[in-house]
């Protein structure tokens, strides 16, 4: 058992970062941080549980942006973030640090929290070592922090697996002389199997070699990620050393304490009942002090390990630990074919042309304030304003010169002429009509409709 400790030194715009603070036009706000620890160095889904533990910081001082001033480093919460771990320290781990904004003052429709930045580091770290410093960038923001893992007595060692115990104070030497003052004495570490990696292996019984997360092999020398058999499942094959197909990861339900198992690619995921936690729901006695609520969830109850905590999730998250993102757009809040965007802290609709409003509920007055040039007239409707242009002009606003005959309106080889009052088609012999669309019958009578009086086949026909 032990504690992972994280100290945030600063959070602010990085070199060349955004000059504006994240608080612009939002009124007073304050920051807080969430830390999540996952075992191993493998790339894990963002929503996978923080199996090693998680914690929330206190809220930082209230901050109000100074208009036009560049954003300084933002005021931080006091104190360390501490994540207790109950089992061996795995040595290799993923560290996820989220910077959250809590909005104060007038809330306009959305929740009180929004995620400003999230950094993920995959690290090797021995327990008991010095503070490790890091600088990470997330977008335009820069986070400076230090971290360490330390064991809590009686555990000691790089994995917190060796136990210390006080020397007995009751044994006295000959002559009943008083004992020496009480002092701590570690048990001699068990003698591990010869060749067991000092860096990646440990033992609790003499002659064994147990591997830290991410390492395998009889002496813990083989990184898991280099195995050519990774992803196959089932028992080891004695001939190849590779895994062969076998039972699924949820067979036998690896989830303890009533957790339900679901398969994920090459692994499984446990959904734990309230009060239980961890990769296999094996951790109980979690309190609000352990920061079990993710994504800005508010923890209530659970002051001691015997009373269950409850996470009140912010909009957009659900699950006993607020670990699952809700598809809020599935409620289809956007009208008139608008596209729903889940921005995390709120939903926004991207409206189709011709619609506006937070939910695209308003029809735009397409012609309002939008003039058509060169004598064109604006036509409402159809989702976007449209100009009906005067002869010789085209384009969205009738600003482009156009060849009125470019559309080739005259059928059957008719010749097009631009006339001041419209287009005129001079039809080829045998055709008539405004667009030369009607063949003339051999007896001089056209197929429907009848030729207007005064026009003979071959005469120019006016295009309305």
């Amino acid at each position: 058992a032990g504690v992972f400790e994280l100290q945030i030194h600063s959070f602010g715009p990085g070199p060349g970062g955004a000059p504006r603070s994240p608080y612009s036009a939002r009124g007073p706000c304050r920051l807080f941080f969430r830390v999540c620890l996952k075992p191993g160095l493998s790339e894990e889904a963002a929503e996978s549980p923080c199996a090693l533990g998680a914690a929330l910081s206190a809220r930082g001082p209230v901050y109000t942006e100074q208009p036009e001033a560049p954003a300084p480093d933002l005021p931080l919460p006091n104190g360390l973030l501490q994540v207790p771990f109950r089992d061996a320290w795995p040595g290799t781990f993923s560290l996820i640090i989220e910077t959250w904004r809590e909005e104060l003052g007038d809330q306009i429709g959305g929740p009180a929290w929004s995620l400003l930045a999230r950094v993920t580091r995959r690290r090797r770290l021995a327990a008991g070592g010095p503070w490790a410093g890091d600088i990470q960038r997330a977008g335009a923001w820069e986070l400076r922090f230090s971290y360490r893992a330390r064991c809590e007595l009686p555990a000691v060692g790089t994995a917190c697996t060796r136990l210390c115990r006080p020397r007995s104070a009751s044994r006295c030497g000959p002559g009943l002389r008083p004992c020496a003052p009480l002092e701590d004495e570690c048990e001699a570490p068990p003698v591990c199997r010869a060749g067991c990696s000092l860096e990646h292996g440990f033992c609790e019984q003499p002659g064994e070699c147990r591997c830290l997360e991410g390492w395998t092999g009889p002496l813990c020398m083989v990184p898991v990620s280099t195995s050519s058999c990774l992803g196959l499942r089932g028992p080891s094959s004695t001939t190849t050393g590779c895994l062969v197909p076998g039972p699924g990861p949820c067979d036998g339900n690896p989830c303890a304490n009533g957790g339900s198992c679901s398969e994920t690619p090459g692994s499984f995921e446990c959904t734990c009942p309230r009060g239980f936690y961890g990769l296999r729901c094996e951790v109980s006695g979690v309190t609000c002090a352990d920061g079990p609520c993710f994504n800005g969830g508010l923890c209530v109850g659970g002051a001691d390990p015997d009373s269950a905590y409850i996470c009140h999730c912010p909009p957009g998250f659900q699950g006993s630990n607020c670990e699952k993102r809700v598809d809020r757009c599935s409620l289809q809040p956007c009208r008139n074919g608008g596209l729903c965007l889940d921005l995390g802290h709120a939903l926004r609709c991207r409206c189709r042309a011709g619609f506006a409003g937070p939910r695209c509920e308003h029809d735009l007055n397409d012609c309002a304030g939008r003039a058509c040039a060169n004598g064109g007239t604006c036509v409402e409707g159809g989702g976007a304003h449209r100009c009906s242009c005067a002869l010789g002009f085209g384009g969205r606003d009738c600003r482009e010169r156009a060849d009125p005959c470019a559309a080739r309106p005259c059928a059957h080889g008719g010749r097009c002429y631009a006339h001041f009052s419209g287009l005129v088609c001079a039809c080829a012999p045998g055709y008539m009509g405004a667009r030369c669309e009607f063949p003339v019958h051999p007896d001089g009578v056209s197929a429907l409709p009848a030729a207007p009086p005064g026009l003979r086949p071959g005469d120019p026909q006016r295009y309305p």
């Epitope: 729903c340 709120a346 926004r348 506006a356 509920e361």
Partner: antibody, heavy 120, light 107 residues
Framework: EVQLVQSGAEVKKPGASVKVSCKAS????????MHWVRQAPGQSLEWMGL????????SYAQKFQGRVTLTVDTSISTAYMELSRLRSDDTAVYYC?????????????WGQGTLVTVSS | DIQMTQSPSSLSASVGDRVTITCKAS??????IAWYQQKPGKSPKALIY???YRYSGVPSRFSGSGSGTDFTLTISSLQPEDVATYFC?????????FGQGTKVEIK
Amino acid sequence: EVQLVQSGAEVKKPGASVKVSCKASGFTFTDYYMHWVRQAPGQSLEWMGLVYPYNGDISYAQKFQGRVTLTVDTSISTAYMELSRLRSDDTAVYYCARQGNYVNNAIDYWGQGTLVTVSS
Amino acid sequence: DIQMTQSPSSLSASVGDRVTITCKASQNVGNIIAWYQQKPGKSPKALIYLASYRYSGVPSRFSGSGSGTDFTLTISSLQPEDVATYFCQQYSDSPYTFGQGTKVEIK
């Protein structure tokens, strides 16, 4: 602090036009829809239309179509409402109000109102 | 257009009383309604959005409920400063429409 400050009271003759201004401060003007709502003496509220300063989109209530013109000047964070061909039943307090552009947002802040009296 | 019908049009109650105002929409508006308080000679003030969410700074004695077509604004313990006219408004569909108002007085 969010503020919407409207121009002063107006007295107009029937057939004339009136233009009311609404100066916004304390928030990013282009991030909010600006609505105009009127209230005749002793009556309820009546929505007239909205304008989105971000891109100039405009929507009018059918009843006011052709008589109302909504405009904005983003350089001075000001919205305008012009009502033409005034009649005596246009006598009312005219309010500007803002609404955020997220799905949940309702109209949340209102100007102090501008009384327009139409009388011959 | 969606009609919003408020009732009662006026009411008189004593300080400390529980006051309930109802609003009925002519068609389903989900929970996309807001409630406003308007004191004499003043502009409206937003109290509730999404039918039941209080704006910050609004006293907890004000609460909203309902969805679909039937909505309620409740003042759990009427205070002298609550004397005002209360309006419901749907902002689900264009044009936005308001109830005719409920005038609340102290007995």
